[in-house]
Amino acid sequence: APVRSLNCTLRDSQQKSLVMSGPYELKALHLQGQDMEQQVVFSMSFVQGEESNDKIPVALGLKEKNLYLSCVLKDDKPTLQLESVDPKNYPKKKMEKRFVFNKIEINNKLEFESAQFPNWYISTSQAENMPVFLGGTKGGQDITDFTMQFVSS
């Protein structure tokens, strides 16, 4: 059965937008005016995983690209990457765990927890123009709260 998806953009709680930085990396920075067109549009798919009232498992693909955010171990550390997939097979309802994030809604803000690595979250730095990464702490210097903006298909 086809997987349900929606198109959206994400901004961190400091209102930084996410843009491509090279072919396989995202960075976060403040955008204004026409520069807003640079921000990446995600195709957020609703997939297999732990589901409750405030937690929904999703996969985050880049719209019209065969790239998905995924979580893997690099040098023994959970790491966020953009992974290329076969567009004939993705998205699917039952995605591999490394592609799955628990979208957690708390006080109108969203967190994205890795299903592969519990308590690791999609994060941005306080500093401008830095890579989006997988962070193992909440409530510290790094930012783990996001807002989502719907984009028409």
Partner: antibody
Framework: QVQLQQWGAGLLKPSETLSLTCAVY????????WSWIRQPPGKGLEWIGE???????NYNPSLKSRVTISVDTSRNQFSLSLSSVTAADTAVYYC?????????????WGQGTLVTVSS | QSVLTQPPSVSVSPGQTASITCSGD??????AFWYQQKPGQSPVLVIY???KRPSGIPERFSGSNSGNTATLTISGTQALDEADYYC?????????FGGGTKLTVL
């Protein structure tokens, strides 16, 4: 409390078509996937296929050419059809619900229907 | 077709810990589920999403999944835990059960 009640012919001849129906009582019908699983006597479980409320299906590749799963949302029922049966299709057939709260796996099962294929 | 391999049988003394394994290619990158089936009954879900317990399932049941192996662990095994246990996962667009393990409580 969710209940799945299934019925259908229990004795078939080779080459006939197996038909089973499962009725769902309690809970929403549209929020779940609905599956069929079978278990030959003394053997393990085999997943047959699934359907959602819109009629979208996935099937086990080994059975795909003979299987049809359909849904009747007005009655909260779904059905299994397996054509050209042989003795190898003798099994207990179960219907089950796949729920988002359990990670889209089978959390409620019917009581099972023994289907015997014999000439 | 994808294969999930389980030992046909596992024996354990009452009060001891039973471990039932399920092996499959890159199984740790998928979600694993476990069912208990007693003779003449429908299967019952005991572990979902690798390590979560449905309500009503005792705490002695736990699960893990990494690499190529998922494991169901029953600590303080009781006589009533004697049953067949099946692992379950997905392969692309379809679902696969392991061959089943008969747990005997000696």
């Amino acid at each position: 409390q969710v209940q799945l009640q299934q019925w259908g012919a229990g004795l078939l001849k080779p080459s006939e078509t197996l038909s089973l129906t499962c009725a769902v009582y309690g809970g929403s019908f549209s929020d779940y996937y609905w599956s069929w699983i079978r278990q030959p006597p003394g053997k393990g479980l085999e997943w047959i296929g699934e359907i959602d409320h819109s009629g979208s299906t996935n099937y086990n590749p080994s059975l795909k050419s003979r299987v049809t799963i359909s849904v009747d949302t007005s009655r909260n029922q779904f059905s299994l059809s397996l054509s050209s049966v042989t003795a190898a299709d003798t099994a207990v057939y179960y219907c089950a619900r796949a729920s988002p709260s359990s990670g889209w796996t089978l959390d409620y099962w019917g009581q099972g229907t023994l289907v015997t294929v014999s000439s | 077709q994808s294969v999930l391999t389980q030992p046909p049988s596992v024996s354990v003394s009452p009060g001891q810990t039973a471990s039932i394994t399920c092996s499959g290619d890159k199984l740790g990158d998928k979600f694993a589920f476990w069912y208990q089936q007693k003779p003449g009954q429908s299967p019952v879900l005991v572990i979902y999403l690798d390590n979560k317990r449905p309500s009503g399932i005792p705490e002695r049941f736990s699960g893990s999944n990494s690499g190529n192996t998922a494991t169901l662990t029953i600590s303080g095994t009781q006589a009533l835990d004697e049953a067949d246990y099946y692992c379950y996962a997905w392969a692309d667009t379809y679902e696969v059960f392991g061959g089943g393990t008969k747990l005997t409580v000696l």
